[in-house]
């Protein structure tokens, strides 16, 4: 069996990823240069490890994460780690753009770095629906697509509602979900006789994928707290998102033996439910009040997240043609929701308390933003899935779904693996 | 006691750099975000720039986008503006002044500037 | 959001009831602070997220209001409350002040 990419992709995709590889380059050279204040060097290495921590969890903690398949584990972190690179610097240009071009040169800081990695992430979370159904050629397209809708949707809720970085950038969780189910709703989906078993979960890969799920629990403080303004609104961040995704690990194992029959526990339940608090909290991390609040919500994200792997993937399959290991999806669009739910909550109970109209408005506000991320969400992901479509990307046939041996060369191998 | 105090003001061409600092006592200097603010000669305050608590993210007034450059060492206490192409209608007295961030109900932190150096005079002539 | 004062200067006695009006071109919430400046000092901050007292001031300075709409109230004037009062709002970038009223002596 042969394991080369067809020949008009071997053409394709070098000369696609290398020009626009190019073009970047160009605008960096003719738009950008770096922040040129002294800064105290401490300081600097400080800041510089919140953007390391979300590199980690982007390259290992999501790359591995979505490693699972038998068939498709070297394709899943690679092509992640593809994707996170392009989506880095085309999230710098274009935030840059959107937000400082007007006066000049965008200057690039560390600052900037950490938010196109967390731009960049939200295509990761996104790609978990279609990776395995998707060539390297497609996913620089929903790089570029992605990418520009929520740097798009960012400037408008910051311009129209005046919202936060760290608000705004909560909405990457509903917004990669939705994006991502979009798209797989619009790629071809039953997969033909003979590949059932290559979207199955194997032990090595279902390690990593363990393995990228720990990444991603250990550095989610760091996520959810990165773009705060104050020390104290960062610290009541790590701590609230600690709390709640410590909780969430407890549920999820303990809630994975309980909704199976013989009490065992599944692993695609535990590598995805880890992370529900983390994604719960995230709104609103910096406003909890105390550590038990944190705590129950990590426990009901847990039993949403487990709950939701147990009876969800059976109707992902069929609707969307997402294989059961690939709930990052939906398990962040229900996750993401409650998130913004919490903070609507907090909203109302602050009007009740202070009998302040204007924070009545807030939540009218709070529900707009939420709207909008969704609609712009779906919106860009069927568009994306439309183009994806195209037969120009030459995307792999149904049979050669979930294949590494499709993109890489194995000589020990000859067939399978 | 909780203080800050600037520095570097003078008389300066108009053209000219100048380099103003603010050094702070009394408080955990890398824990606040930091403003300079300044006010011409009989005029109200004008909000110049402001530099998160790690420095890792700054805002100008358009009035001196690309000319005036913030930053901070916070292993040194002190908060920095760096002020090139200087016109004459920069001429004011320069304030530093550290942001407070403050939860009130449970779902919203408010910024004030809760403490103000006695500031620096810089005046930009020819 | 620019900030409109009013009046931009006003004549009162000690004991008097002062009050200062501030309007925002948009709404900024309560996002909106309340500061005194003597001639030759530093300004003072008075009040905070629009109704919020800062510590240390005397309890005769209020302040209420959201939306477009805010007011300062010293409920009985002293002496050493003759200063020009500036508000400013931190609602979004840029933040901006203000053009101030001052008190002044009868």
């Known amino acids: 069996m042969s394991s080369k990419y067809p020949r008009s992709v071997r053409r394709c995709l070098p000369l696609w990823a290398l020009t626009l590889e190019a073009a970047l380059i160009l605008l960096f050279y003719f738009f950008t240069h770096y922040d040129a204040s002294l800064e105290d060097q401490k300081g600097l290495v400080a800041s510089y490890q919140v953007g390391q921590d979300l590199t980690v969890m982007a390259a290992i903690g999501l790359g591995f994460l979505t490693s699972s398949f038998r068939r498709h584990s070297w394709s899943s972190v690679a092509f992640n780690l593809f994707m996170l690179a392009l989506g880095v610097q085309w999230a710098i240009l274009l935030d840059g753009f959107l937000s400082q071009f007007p006066s000049g040169k965008v200057v690039i800081t560390l600052f900037s770095i950490r938010l196109a990695t967390m731009s960049a992430l939200s295509v990761l979370i996104s790609v978990d629906a279609v990776l395995g159904k998707v060539n390297l050629a497609q996913l620089v397209v929903m790089v570029l697509v992605e990418v520009t809708a929520l740097g798009n949707l960012r400037m408008v809720i910051s311009n129209i509602f005046n919202t936060d970085y760290h608000m705004n950038m909560m909405h990457i969780y509903v917004f990669a979900a939705y994006f991502g189910l979009s798209v797989a709703w619009c790629l071809p989906k039953p997969l033909p006789e003979g590949t059932e078993d290559k979207d199955q979960t194997a032990t090595i890969p279902s390690l990593s994928a363990m393995l990228g799920a720990l990444f991603l629990w250990m550095f989610w403080p760091s996520f959810n707290s990165a773009l705060l303004r104050s020390p104290i609104e960062r610290k009541n961040a790590v701590f609230n998102t600690y709390y709640a995704v410590a909780v969430s690990v407890v549920t999820a194992i303990s809630g994975s033996s309980l909704a199976h029959p013989q009490g065992k526990i599944s692993k695609t339940y535990v590598h995805s439910a880890v992370l529900a608090g983390g994604v719960a909290v995230g709104t609103s991390c910096h406003l909890i009040p105390s550590p038990w609040l944190a705590m129950v919500l990590g426990l009901v994200a847990g039993l949403i997240s487990v709950g939701g792997a147990k009876y969800l993937p059976g109707c992902c399959n069929r609707v969307l043609g997402i294989p059961h290991s690939s709930i990052m999806g939906y398990n962040f669009s229900l996750l993401g929701l409650l998130g913004e739910i919490i903070y609507i909550v907090l909203l109302v109970l602050d009007t009740v308390g202070a009998g302040n109209g204007m924070i009545g408005f807030q939540v009218l506000l709070s529900i707009g933003e939420l709207s909008l991320a969704i609609v712009i969400a779906l919106m860009s992901g069927l568009l994306t899935g439309l183009l994806l479509n195209l037969k120009i990307w030459k995307a792999p046939h149904e049979a050669k779904y979930f294949d590494d041996q499709v993109f890489w060369k194995f000589p020990h191998l000859a067939v399978g693996f | 006691e909780v203080q800050l105090l600037e520095s570097g003001g003078g008389v300066v061409q108009p053209g000219r750099s100048l380099r103003l600092a603010c050094a702070a006592s009394g408080f955990s200097f890398r824990s606040y975000g930091m403003h300079w603010v300044r006010q011409a000669p009989g005029r109200g305050l004008e909000w110049v720039a402001f530099?998160?608590?790690?420095?890792?993210?700054?805002y100008y007034v358009d009035s001196v986008k690309g000319r005036f450059t913030i930053s901070r060492d916070n292993s040194k206490n002190t908060l920095y503006l760096e002020m090139n192409s200087l016109r004459v209608d920069d001429t004011a007295v320069y304030y530093c002044a550290r942001e407070a961030s403050m939860l009130r109900g449970i779902s919203r932190y408010y910024y004030a500037m809760d403490v103000w150096g006695p500031g620096t005079t810089v005046t930009v002539s020819s | 959001a620019e900030l409109t004062q009013s009046p931009s200067s006003l004549s009162a006695s000690v004991g008097d009831r002062v009050t200062v009006t501030c309007r925002a071109s948009q709404s900024i919430s309560s996002y909106l602070n309340w500061y005194q400046q003597k001639p030759g000092k530093a300004p003072k901050l008075l009040i905070y997220a629009a109704s919020s007292l800062q510590s240390g001031v005397p309890s005769r300075f209020s302040g209420s209001g959201s939306g477009t709409d805010f007011t300062l109230t010293i409920s009985s004037l002293q002496p050493e409350d003759f200063a020009t009062y500036y508000c400013?709002?931190?609602?979004?970038?840029?933040?901006?002040f203000g053009q101030g009223t001052k008190v002044e002596i009868k």
């Open positions: 530099t998160w608590f790690d420095g890792s993210n700054k």
């Open positions: 400013q709002q931190s609602y979004s970038t840029p933040w901006t």
